[in-house]
Amino acid sequence: FERTRSLQDPCSNCPAGTFCDNNRNQICSPCPPNSFSSAGGQRTCDICRQCKGVFRTRKECSSTSNAECDCTPGFHCLGAGCSMCEQDCKQGQELTKKGCKDCCFGTFNDQKRGICRPWTNCSLDGKSVLVNGTKERDVVCGPSPADLSPGASSVTPPAPAREPGHSPQ
């Protein structure tokens, strides 16, 4: 019965970008400016999202799809569909109630967002620290101390991996 009724429903013929206008004998009318319908058979069009304030327009609204926002420089998106913007910090910092704060010793953050995470504990894998960690970078683990016995080949990291002022342990 439901299927039969939907086949007879004139609104089901209205494509995306239009709505079924009850005030005009259920004919398909185009969505008004600043509104859209992303599926067919809609009885109303939805208002387009406006990217204001800290939000920037990433994709303009069209008659068939909503606008998409991202965040102004210095901020990043949070939430589904970028529902919020959160300020960036520098690498080596995390955002707290008191603003951007440096990572505590023994932790690092290599991004402009997120929290400081503990350095890898190389000894848990039976390895040694090859390059010390910093606020911005995790430690680099090398071969286990046993592997570095005389005659064993040592692993040298590529030059860019070395942090200035930190020598391998």
């Epitope: 304030g53 800290v54 949070l78 939430g79 529902s83 919020m84 913007c85 959160e86 300020q87 109630k97």
Partner: nanobody
């Protein structure tokens, strides 16, 4: 419609004071952290201060500590920023913003902004 409207900006001499206001409407003001940001000419947005829903927690960027005071009146749906001992480097457009759901628990995202009010500190 959810709206934030700032006022109170103007021209003031170094060492002077101003009080900025932000009138909120269209949402339950008392359920949100509120934040002040500023943008100096040619620079990016900078967080200035924020205040917990009931006003029990307040935090400031180091450069304004001891000079600026954030406050709110939930009965009047209003946010304030009292700015004393103003300096030339405080010259900026000041924006109030609403903390999004979960603000300060898992993140510090904001979702609604005002149009801004201009503060110029100059002799």
């Amino acid at each position: 419609e959810v709206q934030l409207v700032e006022s109170g900006g103007g021209l003031v001499q170094p060492g002077g004071s101003l009080r900025l206001s932000c009138a909120a409407s269209g949402f339950t003001f008392s359920s949100h952290w509120m934040t002040w940001f500023r943008q100096a000419p040619g620079k990016g947005l900078e967080w200035v201060a924020h205040i917990k829903e009931g006003g029990s927690e307040k935090y400031y960027v180091d450069s304004v500590k001891g000079r600026f005071t954030i406050s709110r009146d939930n009965a009047k749906n209003s946010l304030y920023l009292q700015m004393n001992s103003l300096r030339a480097e405080d010259t900026a457009v000041y924006y109030c913003a609403r903390g999004g759901d979960g603000y300060s628990d898992s993140h510090f995202g904001v979702d609604v902004w005002g149009q801004g009010t201009t503060v110029t500190v100059s002799s």
